[in-house]
Amino acid sequence: NFMYSKTVKRLSKLQEYQQYYPSLTCVMEGKDMEDWSCCPTPWTSFQSSCYFISTVMQSWTKSQNNCSVMGADLVVINTKEEQDFITQNLKINSAYFLGLSDPKGWRHWQWVDQTPYNKNVTFWHSGEPNSPDERCAIINFRSEEWGWNDVHCHVPQKSICKMKKIYI
């Protein structure tokens, strides 16, 4: 009976999400493997988040709006482990917008989701950021490693969206 009611709840939750995400990929989690954590297909999952790499070339603001329509934001990177996971799926000759910007050019970097910008957990390439006119951040492959660079926000780039996993 308990299992039945849990399944009914899950199905109604799935139906609720189906209007936003036609397909979800779910895995069983929790100590009793009773919880399901889901990401929209074909997003990838890491820890408690889902990630989507957009190959559409758009400005930073348009990229953020595009993520927002999908219930996400441009990616906020909190740890080296998270960055290492994300970069496994990136092309080394491409650049991708992050959810990091400095709209006034005052070198006051801010994450789109209001996560505090911690200078100690940043992965700027050597010598970056280097221009107050370059107010948006990308991640790219340079000098044999992935790192961040400041670029012009209006110049189209690929992008990475991030959202919280859906728990059902």
């Epitope: 603001t61 709006n65 709209p103 280097n130 948006c136 209006h154």
Partner: antibody
Framework: EVQLVESGGGLVKPGGSLRLSCAAS????????MSWVRQAPGKRLEWVST????????YYPDSVKGRFTISRDNAKNSLYLQMNSLRAEDTAVYYC??????????????WGQGTTVTVSS | DIVMTQSPDSLAVSLGERATINCRAS??????????MHWYQQKPGQPPKLLIY???NLESGVPDRFSGSGSGTDFTLTISSLQAEDVAVYYC?????????FGGGTKVEIK
Amino acid sequence: EVQLVESGGGLVKPGGSLRLSCAASGFTFRSYGMSWVRQAPGKRLEWVSTISSGDSYTYYPDSVKGRFTISRDNAKNSLYLQMNSLRAEDTAVYYCARQIYYDYAYYFDFWGQGTTVTVSS
Amino acid sequence: DIVMTQSPDSLAVSLGERATINCRASESVSFRTSHLMHWYQQKPGQPPKLLIYGASNLESGVPDRFSGSGSGTDFTLTISSLQAEDVAVYYCQQSIEDPPTFGGGTKVEIK
């Protein structure tokens, strides 16, 4: 006083080339992105190319990509536009404009007087 | 590309009267509180001159009879009391993404 003075315009045959120059004074040229904007007779303004302050980025619309090349010489406070394979539709007044960044983009705060390019056989 | 549509194409206003020019973008040129729309004035035989940046910020040295407003896709330039020296063509321009694009212009004349 900010001054931008264009030169190099003239009459050229279709398929020909021209090199426009813009001499800048009254400001620290190397600190600013610069653009070329053109205006065909009786038409709206059309952006032609942009170069960032550090020379690291150049951008062009599809209409001129592969034919026009923007460059700058910060030591000479000069901006250039090399125009090859010119077409009749490139006929316009070409303005050099200084960019000012505002939030996520830029606007043009100073413009030169313009130089006229006429492409005709 | 973002298409900028200005209206009207031309406008005849009496001296001292209000002139209103509209500009519509084919998609939003705002992001949160940033409105990436700018206005220029062009007199015959002269280059464009910046009037308003960021939809509503008056450029230094521009008379305060000029003002701008709007957000998203719809923006307005207002001349509160038209002066003879305001006879010109006025252009809007978006810069939220490359390529920056301009409106077709609105010619303002004295009635």
